[in-house]
């Protein structure tokens, strides 16, 4: 039950996170005009990854797309790439995780397959979240650098009398949305990986019981392997998976490949 809850919660948190990453990527307010030195401006500038906008005090807003690819700063291109990779990985992760959900039955899909899918989606969410956080952080760093550079030559005097105020940009709402969304996706991914451990098929360990039945003596040995009955019908040791409910003392956890993430 706890595994299903962890997996479900991980899925929901990741879903919210990816929706946030998509929203942040599409938002125009990645950088907004810093009004500290010009609080009386009647024209407000803000920029996104795809276009820049100007909002006038009249309420009229005009946005212009960046219709060049080669003319854009490499950092902006890198941020775009990181956000898109984050979205793509997140979307694939969501698709995979839907089929991995314990509460959804698809044919005769084994728990091992679901565990693998849960782990895969979890890793995808983690990478997706990291991509978003990295993208937003790179953009934020770019803003900070430009902010202090423009502060250094804030006013360029013309003839000693006329002032040209250079527009400075500060963090926009999209950055905060991106950071939070990336964090949520990351957390969701970690939760999926944790859930995967619980979903991983466990080695069933039956207690050593020896009893005499009329006719043939059948011994059950510890280790979850069915011993030969002496009839020669089962010469290979096969793992027995018990899908049913077990009491706590019936279950013994063995390290599996899913334990080390």
């Amino acid at each position: 039950m706890a595994v299903t809850a962890c997996q479900g919660l991980g899925f929901v948190v990741s879903l919210i996170g990816i929706a946030g990453i998509i929203a942040a990527t599409c938002m125009d307010q990645w950088s907004t005009q810093d009004l500290y030195n010009n609080p009386v401006t009647a024209v407000f500038n803000y920029q996104g990854l795809w276009r820049s906008c100007v909002r006038e005090s009249s309420g009229f807003t005009e946005c212009r797309g960046y219709f060049t690819l080669l003319g854009l700063p490499a950092m902006l291109q890198a941020v775009r790439a990181l956000m898109i990779v984050g979205i793509v990985l997140g979307a694939i992760g969501l698709l995979v995780s839907i089929f991995a959900l314990k509460c959804i039955r698809i044919g005769s899909m084994e728990d091992s397959a679901k565990a693998n899918m849960t782990l895969t989606s979890g890793i995808m969410f983690i990478v997706s979240g990291l991509c978003a956080i990295a993208g937003v952080s790179v953009f934020a760093n770019m803003l900070v650098t430009n902010f202090w550079m423009s502060t250094a030559n804030m006013y360029t005097g013309m003839g000693g009398m006329v002032q040209t105020v250079q527009t400075r940009y500060t963090f926009g709402a999209a950055l905060f949305v991106g950071w939070v969304a990336g964090g949520l996706t990351l957390i969701g991914g970690v939760m999926m990986c944790i859930a995967c451990r619980g979903l991983a098929p466990e080695e069933t360990n039956y207690k050593a019981v020896s009893y005499h039945a009329s006719g043939h003596s059948v011994a059950y040995k510890p280790g979850g392997f069915k011993a030969s009955t002496g009839f020669g019908s089962n010469t290979k040791n096969k793992k027995i998976y018990d899908g049913g409910a077990r009491t706590e003392d019936e279950v013994q956890s063995y390290p599996s490949k899913h334990d080390y993430v």
Partner: antibody
Framework: EVQLQQSVPELVKPGASVRMSCKAS????????IQWVKQKPGQGLEWIAY????????KYNEKFKGKATLTSDKSASTAYMELSSLTSEDSAVYYC???????????WGQGTLVTVSA | DIVMTQSPSSLTVTAGERVTMTCKSS????????????LTWYQQKPGQPPKLLIY???TRESGVPDRFTGSGSGTDFTLTISSLQSEDLAVYFC?????????FGSGTKLEIK
């Protein structure tokens, strides 16, 4: 067609207050910001303040803070400006105007003449 | 506050003449975000409210004759009337639309010779 109809001229005594109106028609009243401008006889133009009828957000010229108060009535599609503690310096024509592209004022009312005299 | 200085204060002209008036601002009116200059030109005839001619320094308002041309950038702006008509005799004001408070120039009065 956008039209702004302003109230009739006012003759008021010094120290009194006056409230003038600007009735908008030909468009959705909440769509455009309304600006108020002062013009003394034979002189230049002076921006007083604006009001956004959509949310009643206002922005005043520091010079007119405490002198002018802007309000609006959406149901009547009318903007109002009240001038208080009037002196002879307040004798002027007061215009209301709508704002759009480039923060410019494309549509103006005919003006309300306020004369402050004892 | 941004100070708008217009020159000349008055101009005596004849019909058909090319007229040029200037407007200087104490601060740049160029917005880097859209590379537009937030300067507006108005025409005011006696007993009438001002009429919008040009916004964004060079964009002509609809219905304004093409003999009116606005130019300039940053702090120096010009309004040109290519061939003056008798109905163009009026006072012309420039206005800063870039920062509050919006400020107007003192005007240029066109008079007939």
């Amino acid at each position: 067609e956008v039209q702004l109809q302003q109230s009739v001229p006012e003759l008021v005594k010094p120290g009194a207050s006056v409230r003038m109106s600007c009735k908008a028609s030909g468009y959705t009243f909440t769509k455009y910001i309304i600006q108020w401008v002062k013009q003394k006889p034979g002189q230049g133009l002076e921006w007083i303040a604006y009001i956004n009828p959509y949310n009643d957000d206002t922005k005043y010229n520091e010079k007119f803070k405490g002198k002018a108060t802007l309000t609006s009535d959406k149901s009547a599609s009318t903007a109002y400006m009240e001038l208080s503690s009037l002196t002879s310096e307040d004798s002027a024509v007061y215009y209301c105007a709508t704002t759009y592209y480039g923060n410019s004022f494309p549509n103006w009312g005919q003006g309300t003449l306020v004369t402050v005299s004892a | 506050d941004i100070v708008m200085t217009q020159s000349p204060s008055s101009l005596t002209v004849t019909a058909g003449e090319r007229v040029t008036m200037t407007c200087k601002s104490s601060q740049s009116l160029l917005n880097s975000g859209n590379q537009k200059n937030y300067l507006t030109w108005y025409q005011q005839k006696p007993g009438q409210p001002p009429k919008l001619l040009i916004y964004w320094a060079s964009t002509r308002e609809s219905g304004v004759p093409d003999r009116f041309t606005g130019s300039g950038s940053g702090t120096d702006f010009t309004l040109t009337i290519s061939s003056l008509q008798s109905e163009d005799l009026a006072v012309y004001f420039c206005q800063n639309d870039y920062s509050f408070p919006f400020t107007f120039g003192s005007g240029t009065k066109l008079e007939i010779k």
